[in-house]
């Protein structure tokens, strides 16, 4: 199916131009989305182009400024947050990035009633995390790894924890591995629905081995960055969950929530916390061997001022074919009775679907079913459940929003988005106001992205929030590549692929082929989304065919494909890329002497292994920030898929699946290896070991390091990186500069 039809006609050809690398590096064709900052059922805030904070009222159709750009500028604020009682706004400035989600900042509290900043008992700086209570204007914040509470912004703080210590004890914020691989947030504290209680995690990293790397900076001596980072098989953080009554915090102090006995018997993780009511909380735990997850519902005992987690309220989720969940174990969405909930997990046929759990998981009622997957539950109201799935027309790389009426029997299902803008929009997400009175739909493609506002009862479109008109106009004279999403059936495996073809593509001609690969467990590369990026340029200007293939281990097509790679990373992902390349050659328009592969992170690992597969298919390839041995990567991620690197578990495959073990096989390919020296995620160590193995095997290769750059290679490094990779590929494919 052709997703982005070419607008090229002979009469227009003279005025049309190809994409340039400069276009990509300048972000000329980037798009905007609009996510309302909901503050009620019918109101949202949005930061206007001139930086005013504006309140929009959907029902009146009116808007007004609640915070002027003058106020924002007075403290150089880049972000804001309105207190639920609408009396105060926090203004965030001096943003300083730490890891993927975490950052520190300076916070100022502005009183909307009097138009002045709150003076007296100002917040310390820099703060690691700050948030309002869900009701009123209490503040919780983390400073120097300790949690503080303010009843009102101008009040003195109450210190909740005292043991916080850099790189040792983390309160209310995750350590490196929990941030990156488990919580995927910068915070580890959660207010109860009405702000009565505050739950928080304490992470003890005292015994975790430390990764140390040089940060060169501008000084005479480099700094050493030290991060407690558990690699596969290493000592893990010790986690504890506490809850404190924020009304009388000094009364009994923080109370620890007990860990289920079957979890506490060996190493374990805390995976998420969901408040149900002010006096009921749901915690999810996971064994270190991540095929057993326990969901535990705990109740506040007024008499003892403690939290009780009866065994009858423990729900076990176990996988016998792989790990528990998809990338993460899914979180529950509770219904109005405050005990039953909706949750996505594998059904008996091995597809992830929504289930309704009333008493036990064994008695769960399956809500969705089919050879497709439910992906996210957005909202449950009294009468509707909104979710996304890839059911429509059997394309795994699409996302549509559905509504199931749970108030009526039998429940009826309606696709809210399937037929809205069918050609333009096949990949949606949604954002709901209180009680799902209204919602915003954000369409990511395959056409130009568009964000729209809808009535939560009728699903009627109310208005367009962002339609990227400027982008549409800018693209009018650009020769964009054609894109198609199709599938290959090979040995009972379905391999979906996206092919990006030059604008004047002619099947009778031969083109160089570049495979772009990620291929990590539970990932998906073949998606019906809009993008004008580096590979668009390579197709448009340099005449390459680019292909992305979702092989075994990828997501949203059932457990058989997903769990195929369990305990065997680096085997089937590579095989499936190679199989796809052979199929592409059979199509007749690929120049088999000019085939390359490239990838970043997990994709760098797969591209390296593919180049070293000994097939002779690839002339050249690039690995950016690759993993080279699973012994070098984080415990939480690696062990989920590989088990432990011990003799009695899976050490053999850990050793067999390294890039270094295949050093000899790089002799007949051109290899470009790239890594940032300050990569906190996939450590530079990975590429250092590849380089050492290649040198020891006397294999020639090319390399580029980016000093003081992390896993994202951002800023000026990005420009240098893509320019460098472009030169490498053009040389490999004998394309003139």
């Amino acid at each position: 199916i052709v997703l982005r039809p070419s607008r090229v006609h002979n009469s227009e050809e003279n005025t049309m131009r190809a994409l340039t690398l400069k276009d990509i590096l300048n972000g000329t064709f980037s798009y905007k989305t609009f996510f309302p900052n909901w503050i009620s059922g019918q109101e949202y805030l949005h930061q206007s182009a001139d930086n005013n904070i504006v309140l929009y009222n959907i029902e009146t159709g009116q808007s007004y400024t609640i915070l002027s750009n003058r106020t924002m500028k007075s403290v150089n604020a880049s972000n804001y947050g309105l207190s639920p009682d609408r009396q105060f706004v926090y203004l965030e400035s001096d943003y300083s990035k730490l890891w993927r989600y975490s950052y520190t900042a300076t916070y100022y509290i502005y009183d909307l009633s009097n138009g002045e900043f709150v003076r007296g008992n100002e917040l310390p700086r820099p703060i690691q995390y700050l948030c309002w209570s869900p009701v009123g204007s209490k503040l919780a914040y983390v400073y120097q790894n300790n949690i503080y509470l303010k009843q009102r912004p101008g009040d003195p703080p109450f210190q909740i924890t005292f043991n916080g210590r850099e790189n040792k004890i983390f309160n209310g914020i995750p350590d490196w591995v929990y941030e990156e691989e488990m919580l995927a947030t910068k915070y580890a504290l959660w207010w109860s629905p009405n702000g009565k209680f505050l739950a928080y995690a304490e992470f003890n990293d005292t015994d975790i081995p430390v990764i140390a790397y040089s940060y060169y900076g501008d000084e005479q001596y480099p700094r050493t960055i030290n991060i407690p980072y558990p690699k596969a098989g290493a000592k893990n953080p010790v986690v504890r969950i506490f809850i404190i009554d924020t009304t009388y915090p000094a009364y009994v102090g923080p109370q620890e929530v007990p860990v289920p006995a079957m979890i506490a018997s060996s190493d374990y993780y805390f995976s998420w916390l969901t408040w149900v009511t002010d006096e009921r909380v749901c915690l999810q735990w996971l064994k270190r061997v991540q095929n057993v997850s326990v969901l535990s519902i705990c109740d506040f005992r007024e008499d003892w001022q403690t939290w009780d987690c009866p065994k009858t309220q423990e729900h076990i989720e176990e996988s016998r074919t792989g790990w528990a969940g998809g990338f993460f174990v899914s979180t529950p969405v509770f219904s109005y009775d405050a005990i039953s909930y909706y949750k996505i997990f594998s059904d008996k046929d091995g597809y992830k679907h929504i289930h309704y759990i009333k008493d036990t998981v064994e008695n769960a009622i399956q809500i969705t079913s089919g050879k497709w997957e439910a992906i996210n539950i957005f909202r449950v109201t009294q009468d509707s459940l909104f979710y996304s799935s890839n059911e429509f027309e059997e394309y795994p790389g699409r996302r549509n929003i559905y509504r199931i009426s749970i108030g009526s029997y039998p429940p009826s299902k309606k696709c809210v988005t399937c037929h809205l803008r069918k050609e333009r929009c096949q990949y949606y997400t949604a954002s709901f106001s209180d009680y799902a009175k209204y919602y915003a739909l954000v369409c990511y493609g395959p056409g130009i992205p568009i964000s729209t506002l809808h009535d939560g009862r009728t699903d009627q479109e109310i208005k367009i929030l962002e339609e990227n008109k400027e982008l549409e106009n800018a693209l009018k004279n650009i020769q964009l590549p054609k894109e198609e999403i199709k599938k290959l059936e090979v040995d009972e495996i379905t391999l979906w692929y996206k092919m990006i073809l030059p604008p004047q593509f002619d099947r009778s001609k031969k083109y160089p082929l570049l495979i772009q690969v990620y291929g990590g467990p539970c990932s998906q590369s073949v998606r019906s989304v809009f993008a004008v990026n580096w590979i668009s340029y390579l197709a448009s200007k340099e005449g390459m065919v680019i292909a992305l293939v979702d092989g075994r281990g990828t997501a949203f097509q059932g457990d058989k494909l997903l769990y195929a790679v369990y305990r065997k990373l680096g085997v089937y992902e590579v095989e499936d890329q190679i199989t796809a390349v052979r199929k592409f050659i059979e199509m007749g328009f690929i120049d088999e002497k000019r085939i390359a592969i490239w990838g970043w992170s997990y994709g760098g690992y797969v591209s390296s292994l593919a180049l070293a597969s000994g097939t002779g298919l690839f002339k050249c390839g690039i690995a950016v920030a690759p993993v080279s041995s699973w012994e070098y990567y984080a415990s939480v991620y690696t062990e989920r898929f590989m088990g432990l690197p011990t003799k009695d578990d899976n050490l053999e495959h850990y050793k067999n699946s390294t890039v270094m073990a295949r050093a000899e096989y790089f002799r007949n390919v051109d290899y470009l290896l790239i890594h940032g020296t300050a990569d906190d995620n996939v450590h530079f160590q990975n590429s250092a070991q590849i380089a050492k193995a290649l040198v020891n095997a006397q294999v020639d290769f090319q390399a580029m390091w980016y000093s003081d750059q992390n896993h994202g290679l951002s800023g000026l490094s990005t420009n240098h990186l893509y320019t460098h990779m472009t030169h490498f590929l053009k040389q490999c494919f004998s394309l003139s500069d």
Epitope: L55, N57, T60, Y64, L67
Partner: nanobody, 118 residues
Framework: QVQLQESGGGLVQAGGSLRLSCVVS????????MGWYRQAPGKRRELVAS???????NYADSVKGRFTISRDNAKSTVFLQMNSLKPEDTAVYYC????????????TYWGTQVTVSS
Amino acid sequence: QVQLQESGGGLVQAGGSLRLSCVVSGTILSSNSMGWYRQAPGKRRELVASISTDGSTNYADSVKGRFTISRDNAKSTVFLQMNSLKPEDTAVYYCNFHPPVVRDWGDTYWGTQVTVSS
């Protein structure tokens, strides 16, 4: 054009009562959260009471138990019933959206003067 017109202020003795009214035009009152604010001479403006679209209310600590905010959506009017008035309640009382519209208050809103004598 949205307009807010306050009335009901006046001079009253300590312990007395007043009922302030705010007629809202140019918008749908029922869809807006509203607030009563006040500013005493030489003091900062402060929120006295607010009422959300679902009718839930919020009060400044200094007026809790004495003042009551309410609304009559049919009449597009927001009220502030003030009982057991104290001299420190003396101020100009303004009606506004909640959170308030950012404007120069003096220019836009006349307010209504409440003076409590001892």
